[in-house]
């Protein structure tokens, strides 16, 4: 007995389609082990005609994918656009060679079976409406209309000429003539169920003259499209229901054991499993809505449905459409922190995966909004200038070509508490939430600017330090200007080698940076920050004021600016300080400049991908050094 | 709620025949499984056979011992899942239930499925 399983017959009809879901034990091996599908001859051979390292034949180019489930110890082979000439016996199975362990299934593909030709069929989906056809002679014109359905015994009345109604159909069954035409009633039923199904006369007049027509009604229930996701991306549900439901509130909901439970509709109703990591975006007038769920979960797999009603939930008789949701623990989509904590004053450094094959792409970063049907305004993006809101405390960090992003936020403070979505504008599967946790500081910030008040003087020097606990010793130090397009990193170097001390003081380690002479253009933004490699750590904030010389005291008060300009993390950072001038860049408005939602995967902004580094110092001409201070005793 | 009921059970000699069926009714959808799966007593619930359909496509499993005797199909119009039960044997003998599923699970399995029927008796003598 094969420990492989599956169905033993698998039959569909040409055109269509067949998902072939094979069992294998839970063994490390198997889980790892070719997964195959193979034709048997006449000769016994069995021809591989796709396997899961990769080979597909010629003759399922286009149309088979072979999909392993190692959580669930299962694979599925797809095979659309059946033909007649797909009928025969396969297997399917595991190991290095077809003669593996495996378990044979046979596929039938039968023709699109002919109908009786006295019979008129019509298939129409559950939650639809049908107007049924029903021709008579002339001479039938004055006598009684009518429309029932077979029963075992009988044919039970549905509605009449004279206005008779079964009581299962008020409200949803209408007779009725077009214009002039006598040789022809309609009966239009809607809100179809299931139990609306099955055979039905038209009748016009009574005994042996009567014209009579035989209607077979096939009510459908949608067959669910299959959804194959990997764990952590995101998923699209496209729902179309037609112009008939476009004013209905819409509903995604998620089949149990009972009930449909809603997880989001566009009443305000949302599963808090969901929170923050889903949204509900009307298309058009055609009652077309998308929902949009990101960070996919292993329990998030199963049997999803949408639908209009005006309650917002599932109702019998109304149109819907559904899907099965597979998630794959086998994921491309690498394994980050969904919850990042801060503290007030403090900063964070998000780590943004993208797909490596999409450096190009433009990078965004949005706040999730749970208010109406969800919205993600955008505040920061490669071409997209930082929400005003945000001034002097955000910046994107793009790394060419290794899959990752930095978003750094810092002046934290509770209100920045919430979800955040990295997205970019090319592969939509690589959409990630994270949710950031603010607590109230409750201790003195890791990296320190002084003056704090930062004022500096037209045509003179000005030197700012940045002061670093010594967990940082190790750490690359930088300064960066800030502007709305990122913070251009300010090239540093060394001011001598570095000296090794036995003792760290923890009050002398400083990164400076100089402004000499202090142009206008100098005024704005500092950030001081550490970061290992490309990875991005702490950072502070501070403001500097140009103001021109004037007589008596050349300082004034501290702009409000620097008083949120600390920072505490358990992160670690870098050292350095500057001299000379920066080349002001011109800041190009980004693509979110008037539309700033990121509303919807397929709307996305698919403008050019020239990418704007807002992490380079391309251009700069400014210079900072290291300087390390060692006290002796 | 979908309910399912069983009918169709009874007693019959070895060798011969038995049609069982299952009917389901409350909730549908365009995708399900049914299976038939057998107690003894004294024994655990046994798989028989299951078939799950998606649009016009269907899919049909069976257990080794029953392969080639028992057939599963299923009645559109009447929403049920006949199961023919030929060359009955003495040891075929149990209560017959009938699982069904909107998910895709391994069908073997009970914990696969959601909704159960009360049962049919089959008793065969030799």
């Known amino acids: 007995k094969s420990p492989i399983f599956g169905p033993q017959e698998v039959s569909s009809i040409e055109g269509d389609s067949v998902s072939i879901t094979c069992y294998y034990p839970d063994t490390s091996v198997n889980r790892h082990t070719r997964k195959y599908w193979c034709r048997q001859g006449a000769s016994g051979m069995c021809t591989t005609l796709i396997s899961s390292n990769g080979y597909l034949s010629k003759e399922y180019s286009g149309r088979a994918n072979l999909i392993n489930f190692p959580e669930n110890n299962t694979f599925v082979i797809n095979i659309e656009q059946l033909t007649q000439d797909d009928t025969g016996s396969y297997k399917c199975g595991l190991g290095t060679s077809n003669r593996g362990l495996s378990f044979d299934v046979s596929l039938e593909v039968s023709q699109v079976p002919e109908l009786p030709s006295d019979t008129h069929v019509y298939t129409k989906d559950i939650g639809r409406n049908v107007t049924i056809e029903c021709p008579f002679k002339r001479e039938n014109a004055p006598s009684k209309k009518s429309l029932c359905k077979k029963t075992n015994q009988s044919c039970e009345l549905v509605i009449d000429s004279t206005e008779k109604v079964n009581p299962s159909y008020i409200g949803r069954a209408k007779l009725f003539m077009k214009g002039t035409d006598l040789t022809v009633f309609y009966v239009n039923i809607s809100h179809l169920t299931h139990n609306d199904a099955g055979l039905y006369i038209c009748q016009a007049g009574e005994g042996p003259s009567a014209d009579k027509k035989n209607v077979d009604l096939q009510v459908l229930a949608p067959e669910p499209e299959l959804l194959y996701k990997d764990l952590r991306s995101s998923v699209t549900f496209e729902c179309d229901l037609g112009r008939e439901v476009a004013n209905e509130a819409k509903y995604l909901c998620r089949m149990n054991k009972e009930t449909c439970d809603v997880i989001i509709n566009t009443l305000g109703k949302r599963d808090p499993d969901f929170e923050g990591r889903i949204l509900i975006t009307p298309k058009d007038d055609n009652g077309r809505f998308s929902v949009l769920i990101t960070g996919l979960r292993k329990e998030d797999a199963g049997h999803y449905q949408c639908g209009a009603h005006s309650s917002g939930l599932p109702q019998e008789g109304w149109p819907i459409q559904t899907w099965q949701l597979f998630v794959n623990e086998e994921s491309t989509i690498p394994n980050r922190r969904s919850v990042v904590k801060g503290v007030t004053g403090g900063s964070v450094a998000i780590a943004c995966p993208y797909n490596p094959k999409e450096s190009s792409s433009l990078k965004y970063w949005c706040r999730w909004e749970g208010d109406g049907n969800g919205h993600c305004p955008v505040l920061v993006g490669t071409q997209a200038q930082v929400q005003e809101e945000y001034e002097g405390r955000l910046a994107l960090f793009d790394q060419p070509g290794n899959g990752t992003y930095t978003v750094i936020l810092n002046q934290l403070t509770t209100e920045d508490a919430g979800f955040y979505w990295c997205l970019t504008n090319g592969d939509s599967r690589w959409r990630t939430t994270i949710e950031l946790q603010v607590a109230e500081a409750t201790r003195e910030p890791n990296l320190e600017v002084t003056p704090q008040n930062a004022t500096a003087v037209l045509g003179e020097t000005f030197t700012v330090s940045c002061h670093y606990p010594c967990k940082f010793y190790s750490q690359e130090k930088y300064w960066c200007k800030w502007s709305n397009k990122g913070c251009h990193i300010l090239p540093s170097h060394d001011e001598g080698a570095r000296q090794s001390s036995v003792s760290c003081d923890q009050s002398s380690q400083l990164v400076s940076m100089t402004l000499n002479p202090v142009s206008k253009e100098d005024e704005g933004w500092y950030w001081c920050g550490v970061k290992q490699g490309q990875t991005y750590g702490e950072t502070t904030a501070i403001y500097i004021a140009v103001e021109e010389r004037t007589r008596g005291s050349s300082h004034v008060n501290p702009t409000d600016a620097n008083a949120r300009a600390k920072v505490a993390l358990e992160e670690e950072v870098v050292d350095s300080s500057i001299s000379e001038k920066e080349n002001k860049a011109i800041p190009n408005p980004g693509p979110f400049a008037n539309e700033r939602e990121i509303q919807n995967v397929g709307d996305q902004a698919q403008e050019n991908r020239a990418s704007g580094d807002a992490g380079s110092a391309d251009g700069q001409s400014r210079s900072s050094s290291s300087k390390h201070h060692h006290h002796h005793h | 709620e979908v309910q399912l009921v069983e009918s169709g059970g009874g007693l019959v000699q070895a060798g011969g025949s038995l049609r069982l069926s299952c009917a389901a009714s409350g909730r549908t959808f365009g995708s399900y499984s049914m299976g038939w799966f057998r107690q003894a007593p004294g024994k655990e619930r046994e798989f028989v056979g299951a078939i799950s359909w998606s649009g016009s496509s269907t899919y049909k499993y069976y257990e080794d011992s029953v392969k080639g005797r028992f057939t599963i199909s299923r009645d559109n119009a009447k929403n049920t899942v006949p199961l023919q039960m030929n060359s009955l044997k003495p040891e075929d003998t149990g209560v017959y239930f009938c699982?069904?599923?909107?998910?895709?699970?391994?069908?073997?399995?009970?914990?696969?499925?959601?909704?159960w029927g009360q049962g049919t008796l089959v008793t065969v003598s030799s």
């Open positions: 699982g069904g599923t909107m998910e895709r699970r391994d069908p073997r399995r009970t914990s696969a499925y959601d909704y």
